[in-house]
Amino acid sequence: REAAPKSYAIRDSRQMVWVLSGNSLIAAPLSRSIKPVTLHLIACRDTEFSDKEKGNMVYLGIKGKDLCLFCAEIQGKPTLQLKEKNIMDLYVEKKAQKPFLFFHNKEGSTSVFQSVSYPGWFIATSTTSGQPIFLTKERGITNNTNFYLDSVE
């Protein structure tokens, strides 16, 4: 039987959720007037880039959209983007699609996502509402790299 992605709402410690704005992901306060994305998460079957200390390798997509999170270098800086791609198309590939891969690590009750293409760069939200979700190598005060995966199904 083919695997199915797991579905989660994603939230940070300041109760910010991920929201789709056009073809970008932004962080916005948890609110009745805001529709948070449902994150699709599925493990990569290929073990080529695996590193158990960093976590499980996963693909991340947006439920209901053919959009997946993707890392690319823009002007010399690792950048988080959304690319038109069905998460199951990535999953069925025999070879790991490195730019779409993230190490998913658990830290207590929170989840951390590190780019496989750019080790040391983590998915983050800033302290300001309405800002894009981005990649950072600075974990700490000025941004948030720890997320709660809330079951929505």
Epitope: P29, L30, I34, T110, Y148, S151, V152
Partner: antibody, heavy 122, light 111 residues
């Protein structure tokens, strides 16, 4: 239907630790996306949030009380509890437990216990 | 001093309309966190009256309505009745405190 019931001593001596328990019925304390809070109301005054714990076990405390407060969950008894150390007369209040769901009440509290009066006095 | 500011008291005659304001800041209401309103009748626990700025839980009469704009919110009560005499509290979330915040409460007197 979810119901909450506070319990604990009504009288606590100054400098001691106030301990209260909130028993949850009609639902599981580990149910996804729920948060559980403690709110107090000094006599004749307004509501003051003390702290919360959610289904992940994450705790959040009012900054001015953080050094004295501990909130924990006992899943086997379907309860959550409040401990407030080094109490003074200023901690005399009616203590309420309350709950909400991140994706249904959006950081509001839709179910409350009836409250329990705690007096700090020697 | 409460993080959210409410008038200490308001009053109105039966049948009238009254409003209660709730003023916050850029780290709570102004940051687009929702505002919730509670009614506390004398000697009882608070009851959720409005959630998510303008939504009534089932059983709450449509005489009660909420709104929000910028860093402020308000609760309106139309067709005032004697049983509306109570304390009313607004509540939101504040990201700078990583916690829930309440207004100081407003005592509604029905004349």
């Amino acid at each position: 239907e979810l119901q909450l019931q506070e319990s604990g001593p009504g009288l606590v001596k100054p400098s001691e630790t106030l301990s209260l328990t909130c028993t949850v019925s009609g639902g599981s304390i580990t149910a996804s996306n729920y948060y559980w809070g403690w709110i107090r109301q000094p006599p004749g005054k307004g509501l003051e949030w003390i702290g919360s714990i959610d289904y992940t076990g994450s705790t959040y405390y009012e900054p001015s009380l953080k050094s004295r407060v501990t909130i924990s969950v006992d899943t086997s008894k379907n309860q959550f509890s409040l401990k407030l150390s080094s109490v003074t007369a200023a901690d005399t209040a009616v203590y309420y437990c309350a709950t909400g769901n991140y994706y249904e009440t959006y950081l509001g509290f839709d179910v409350w216990g009836q409250g329990t009066l705690v007096t700090v006095s020697s | 001093e409460s993080v959210l500011t409410q008038p200490p008291s308001v009053s109105g005659a039966p049948g009238q309309r009254v409003t209660i304001s709730c003023t916050g800041s850029s780290s709570n209401i102004g940051a687009h966190y929702d505002v919730h309103w509670y009614q506390q009748l004398p000697g009882t626990a608070p009851k959720l009256l409005i959630y998510g700025n303008d939504n009534r839980p089932s059983g709450v009469p449509d005489r009660f309505s909420g709104s929000k704009s910028g860093t402020s919110a308000s609760l309106a009560i139309t067709g005032l009745q004697a049983e509306d005499e109570a304390d009313y509290y607004c509540q939101s979330y504040d990201y700078s405190l990583s916690g829930y915040v309440f207004g100081g409460g407003t005592k509604l007197t029905v004349l």
